[in-house]
């Protein structure tokens, strides 16, 4: 019977008695940094290409007896697991093996470095179709590592990564913490996050995606036809590099950021238990495990959108924290969190020729997350609209004036270190979806944008007794670009999306009382593309 | 042993293709960074990946390697440059004392050096 | 081009044994192994195990446990089958192919066990 | 063993026909099927692998088809060169095993 990880990864439309779906990878291939691997075994032959790379250290110890079976099997494991024949994600992936690791799966930042140098000098001198690199492997956090992959990443390569094993914030470890890198946590057959002893899974920010991880059976080194069952983030990786293998082969012009879009997109939503992870890293991991996509085609009609949180900003009054989306997304809103509440919102900012989206701490504040929307627009052309401080009762308000321009995020931020606490503020009047309101005190950002048939919408849920929190989704068809809460009270710890979802979140309710200062709003704005619709009907 | 000689016959060699007179500071305004990795234990110190300003030429990174070579033989230090990048990111890595580290970091075109560490299969 | 070249012909007593060589060429040799299969005249096809070139393991068939011994040398590129205590049955020819996939074959050797 | 049954044995035709072999095995073995020609004197040389992939350099007059237990081999158009005989081979499971052949003859 198919093991259970392909059965999670696989929708239902493709289980059948075995796992078999269209088109396994063919025409891509996928690059392997690990140890040596037993290349004939019968798993895994005429699939993987052993190069003559090598860049290992010794290993450690005096005692140490060298088994080759002992040193291929990591690498071995987990080229059966990508493109394995009988156990494999995409058994028509052909691979090539660099061993960057030692029999004691141990190697060096400058080892590894030198081997995706070999991948890109080999690319050049012979390019192939789509490239996959997966680094299972992790050390701490490496500014130079990070580098290279955002190098290889920026000529069109896909590099995924394990997001480590020491039940530890992904951000602490490269590659995982490259934010060019696709990373991936595991989780076992109940969808739970996996424990490795007395450790586990990475998790936080720099996490994409979980992926099945524990249990995993897959090609042993012991024989030529032995399986034994592995866990780790390694494995889980593999199954990403797997699916991106697919997605690659059906869609081999795909960008980076439109096969992490995708593999976002795809994954089943919300089924990992979150009370494994602190409390404070609950919000910023991701609740998705990837899985193929239903179809190999027609998902280009979508609008695709994630959500991406920023390193803490650290407590002091002036701290600031920045989002940013990658080189091929746009930026279509900004939203902050504080755990204390305190925060002096946020703005969209021009950096460096892009939007970035700064949040900014307050006096006696703990820190602040800036949260970006990064969308795939295409021909998408966006603009900041600000509005100063009104200083009038009705609050300030901007919106987007320019013909086509269609509103995609608010964002508000405020100099005062207590807004909110003077004056009510007032609910914006109805049937003015276009515009951005805020406190009278904050200054209003709207994000508006003009793209070839964007179209959005405002949706509210408001609640008028305290609440810790209020959530509104978009329907199905639409895609969450903006989320922000109506009017920005002090006691509002800030919104973020969630998937489809925009989750505004308050002070505990025992703390603030009933008043009408408990009245809190969540924003969505909605949007989709008619454009993109009518021409994946055309395709079709 | 071999080893050894090798080494020092490409620093007398780098020696002599070296000036004496050569600047020691970097490019004005900009100041090299040394980063390592946080975790004790997975530290490689000795060995040390010099990364070099973005648009740096091959010939350029062989140069700077080279004069690192030869400052570091003024001193009476022992170097060895283990690989030149270029492809992906233009540098070196160099198998030298961590007490060279302030003479390299002052190296024209250098961007930041990270000490060598560990990774593990996961 | 990918070829798998093999040893002549041979003639043995029973009781005997014969070793039949394989040598390898056109593809990197690690990535796949070495299947042995024979063909008594006039009969099918009968798989009889692999051997590795990467690390020297072997898969026998049940039937040729204890009797034959499948080895490589990489540094000739070369597989070799030994057959010990030879029978008449063991009359047929012997296939080198490529890999458990047998996707390449030798040209066959062909052992006759004859008093 | 997973015992792999050929059908016919043997068959004659004419150059031009369309031909079809069937092979059964004792147990499912999903796609893992491959079909082999011989001709006299020579050694096998693979033509399908995987069911109904085929190698490159094999002409596409041939083709394979099935899954689990029951699979067929056709050629769409006999030609003088495809006189031979016609093994399958399951590979699901070690020890691979063939069924007996089917030798096709010149009607």
């Known amino acids: 019977s198919i093991p259970w990880n392909l059965e999670r990864i696989t929708p239902p439309r493709y289980r059948a008695d075995e796992y078999q779906p269209p088109d396994g990878g063919s025409l891509v291939e996928v690059y392997l940094l690990d140890t040596s691997i037993q290349s004939d075994h019968r798993e895994i032959e005429g699939r993987v290409m052993v190069t003559d790379f090598e860049n290992v250290p010794e290993e450690d110890g005096t005692r140490f007896h060298r088994q080759a079976s002992k040193c291929d099997s990591h690498g071995t494991h987990l080229a059966g697991v990508v493109s394995g024949r009988d156990a494999g994600v995409a058994k028509g992936a052909s691979m090539r093996s660099l061993r960057v690791l030692n029999c004691q799966g141990k190697g060096t930042v400058s080892g590894t470095l030198i081997g995706l140098e070999f991948i890109r000098k080999s690319q050049l001198v012979q390019p192939v179709g789509p490239l996959v690199v997966l680094l299972p492997l992790a050390g701490g956090y490496s500014r130079v590592l990070n580098a290279a992959c955002q190098r290889l990443a920026r000529a069109g390569v896909v590099l995924v990564t394990a997001a480590g094993n020491f039940r530890d914030d992904a951000c602490l470890y490269s590659p995982a913490s490259a934010p060019e890198v696709i990373t991936v946590g595991a989780t076992n057959a109940q969808d739970q996050p996996v424990t490795l002893g007395t450790l586990g899974t990475n998790f936080g920010r720099c996490v994409d995606l979980f992926a099945p991880g524990e249990d995993i059976i897959g090609a042993s080194s012991d024989c030529s036809t032995c399986f034994v069952s592995q866990s780790g983030t390694s494995q889980a990786a593999a199954h990403v590099a797997g699916i991106a293998a697919m997605m690659l082969s059906a869609e081999p012009e795909l960008t980076l950021a439109e096969l992490r879009q995708r593999l976002i997109h795809f994954s089943a939503k919300d089924v990992i238990n979150e009370a494994w992870f602190p409390e404070d890293q609950r919000v910023l991991t991701p609740n998705l495990v990837a899985a193929l996509p239903p179809s190999t085609h027609g998902a280009g009609w979508q609008l695709f959108c994630r959500t991406v949180w920023s390193a803490h900003s650290g407590p002091t009054r002036m701290a600031t924290a920045v989002a940013r989306c990658a080189p091929d997304e746009e930026l279509l809103s900004c939203s902050s969190f504080s755990r204390s509440g305190k925060r002096r919102g946020e703005r969209m900012e021009a950096q460096g020729g892009k939007l970035v989206c700064r949040a900014h701490n307050a006096f006696g504040g703990e820190g602040v997350y800036a949260i970006a929307r990064c969308c795939l627009l295409p021909q998408a052309n966006c603009s900041v609209h600000t509005a100063p401080p009104a200083e009038a009762s009705m609050g300030t308000r901007v919106h987007c004036h320019q013909q086509g321009h269609v509103l995609t995020g608010c964002s508000s931020h405020w100099e005062v270190e207590d807004l909110g606490t003077h004056k009510p503020p007032v609910l914006r009047p109805r049937g003015q979806p276009n515009q951005c309101v805020g406190h009278r005190e904050a200054s209003i950002h709207a994000s508006c944008c003009h793209a070839p048939g964007l179209e959005c919408k405002v949706k509210e849920h408001g609640i008028p007794a305290p609440q810790e929190q209020v959530t509104v989704a978009c329907e199905e068809g639409w895609t969450l670009t903006g989320c922000s809460a109506l009017p920005g009270t002090s006691h509002v710890l800030g919104a973020y999306a969630v998937d489809n979802t925009c989750v505004v979140r308050s002070r505990d309710v025992s703390t603030t009382g009933s008043t009408s200062e408990g009245a809190v709003t969540a924003v969505a704005i909605c949007c989709r593309s008619r454009h993109l619709a009518q021409a994946s009907q055309e395709l079709q | 042993q071999e080893d050894e000689d090798g080494d020092y016959e490409e620093l007398v060699l780098a020696l002599r293709s070296e000036e004496d007179g050569l600047a020691e500071a970097p490019e004005h305004g900009t100041t090299a960074t040394f980063h390592r990795c946080a975790k004790d234990p997975w530290r490689l110190p000795g060995t040390y990946v010099v990364v070099l300003k973005e648009e740096t030429h091959l010939s350029q990174s062989e140069r700077t390697a080279r004069r690192l070579q030869a400052q570091a033989a003024r001193r009476g230090y022992l170097t060895k440059i283990l690989h030149v990048f270029h492809g992906l990111l233009p540098g070196f890595l160099v198998k030298m004392s961590g007490d060279l580290l302030e003479l390299a970091l002052k190296l024209p075109h250098v961007d930041y050096i990270e000490e060598d560490s560990s990774v593990f299969a996961q | 081009q990918v070829q798998l070249v093999q040893s002549g012909a041979e003639v043995k007593k029973p009781g005997a044994s014969v070793k039949v060589s394989c040598k390898a060429s056109g593809y990197t040799l690690n990535n796949y192994g070495i299947s042995w299969v024979r063909q008594a005249p006039g009969q099918g096809l009968e798989w009889m195990g692999w051997v590795s070139f990467y690390n020297g393991n072997t898969n026998y068939a049940q039937k040729l446990q204890g009797r034959g011994t499948m080895t490589t040398d990489p540094s000739t590129s070369t597989a070799y089958m030994e057959l010990r205590s030879l029978r008449s049955d063991d009359t047929a020819v012997y296939y080198c192919?490529?890999?458990?996939?047998?996707?390449?074959w030798g040209q066959g050797t062909t052992v006759t066990v004859s008093s | 063993d997973i015992q792999m049954t050929q059908s016919p044995s043997s068959l004659s035709a004419s150059v031009g026909d369309r031909v079809t072999i069937t092979c059964r095995a004792s147990q499912s073995i999903n796609n893992w099927l491959d079909w082999y020609q011989q001709k006299p004197g020579k050694a096998p040389k693979l033509l399908i692998y995987?069911?109904?992939t085929r190698p490159s350099g094999v002409p596409s007059r041939f083709s394979g088809s099935g899954s689990g237990t029951d699979f067929t081999l056709t050629i769409s158009s006999l030609q003088p060169e495809d006189f031979a005989t016609y093994y399958c081979q399951q590979d699901q499971d070690i020890p691979p095993t063939f069924g007996q052949g089917t030798k096709v003859e010149i009607k």
């Open positions: 995987a069911a109904s």
């Open positions: 192919a490529r890999g458990y996939v047998m996707d390449i």
